[in-house]
Interface confidence: medium
């Protein structure tokens, strides 16, 4: 089956700048600003566009060693990024893949709202564990806040 979870979170960073840093340069930024969450991001194939495969490795002590993500869509105009988790981590006997959409929407106050949709494609009748969804949400929040802090501290970066 397919289980769809949607989340919103706010950021004080303008949409265009956040998209540039958090989405387009996350591979470089995440290990730098959140080494406690991501130890490395390696480009396996592709140039960052659709079809690109990335290997994200986690630090010692994490329940998973790595995941492989596939880039599905990068929309620079609407600040939208679609990718799928296709290997490693929770992918296995019960879970086929996780399709994710991140959309960054500008807010009138100059900040932005991130709209995140996660579709868990399970095998057969298996359900998604709430803890798994919560852990994924917390990881996303950790990365976002780390990038946000970096951008607030480096006003000249990603403008």
């Amino acid at each position: 089956g397919v289980f769809n979870y949607e989340t919103e979170t706010t950021s004080v960073i303008p949409a265009a700048r956040l998209f540039k840093a958090f989405i387009l340069d996350g591979d470089n930024l995440f290990p730098k600003v959140a080494p406690q969450a991501i130890s490395s991001v390696e480009n396996i194939e592709g140039n960052g566009g659709p079809g690109t495969i990335k290997k994200i490795s986690f630090p010692e002590g994490f329940p998973f060693k790595y995941v492989k993500d596939r880039v599905d869509e990068v929309d620079h105009t609407n600040f939208k990024y679609n990718y799928s988790v296709i290997e490693g981590g929770p992918i296995g006997d019960t879970l086929e893949k996780i399709s994710n959409e991140i959309k960054i929407v500008a807010t009138p106050d100059g900040g932005s709202i991130l709209k995140i949709s996660n579709k868990y494609h399970t095998k057969g009748d298996h359900e998604v564990k709430a803890e798994q969804v919560k852990a994924s949400k917390e990881m996303g929040e950790t990365l976002l806040r780390a990038v946000e802090s970096y951008l607030l501290a480096h006003s000249d970066a990603y403008n």
Partner: antibody
Amino acid sequence: QVQLVESGGGVVQPGRSLTVSCAASGFTFSDYNMHWVRQAPGKGLEWVAIIWYDGSNEFYADSVKGRFAISRDNSKNTLYLQLNSLRAEDTALYYCARDNFHTSGYPWSWGQGVLVTVSS
Amino acid sequence: DIQVTQSPSSLSASVGDRVTITCRASQDISSYLAWFRQKPGKAPRSLIYAASSLQSGVPSRFSGSGSGTNFTLTIRSLLPEDFATYYCLQYNSYPRTFGRGTKVEVK
């Protein structure tokens, strides 16, 4: 199961204030965004306001911005809507509603509504 | 603000009919659209979210489709309890906005 019970409605004069409440049970209230949606007699649904699970963000419909205030007390599992500077066009059934999953942003489970009538 | 235009405003149908209701958003809302059914004197009930995901416990005769600006709710084979008013809601941005509703009446 999810239960939302609104209270505090009634007849109020134009220009006056009123606070309606929504008592929540059957779920972890502090995990979910909450909405107010209203429906004027014989009319369609109008989204009024949302407050995030931790009270960190509030958003309002243009028609009520600056007049209505949404708030919550997570220790009491209660959602509030303070209606100020009331107008005849605010007469409606006011529903409180819970988000579907943490912070998805749309009303999923609804109460039965509380009627607010603005009349002199 | 995003405007949501729902059509038709009302329609007449019989039990067993296939019914289609459409909503059009004034700008791209991706898949951030939900559908609700409201019976007279009752609170609305969520049917579909994310344009096409069926809410838990909702019968499979209901389906949703679309993305971007054009969306459709289809009721495959109308049952007596389906005579009600249906609303769509965009939740791509604030303020959230509902369509004006479609009343499905008995022919």
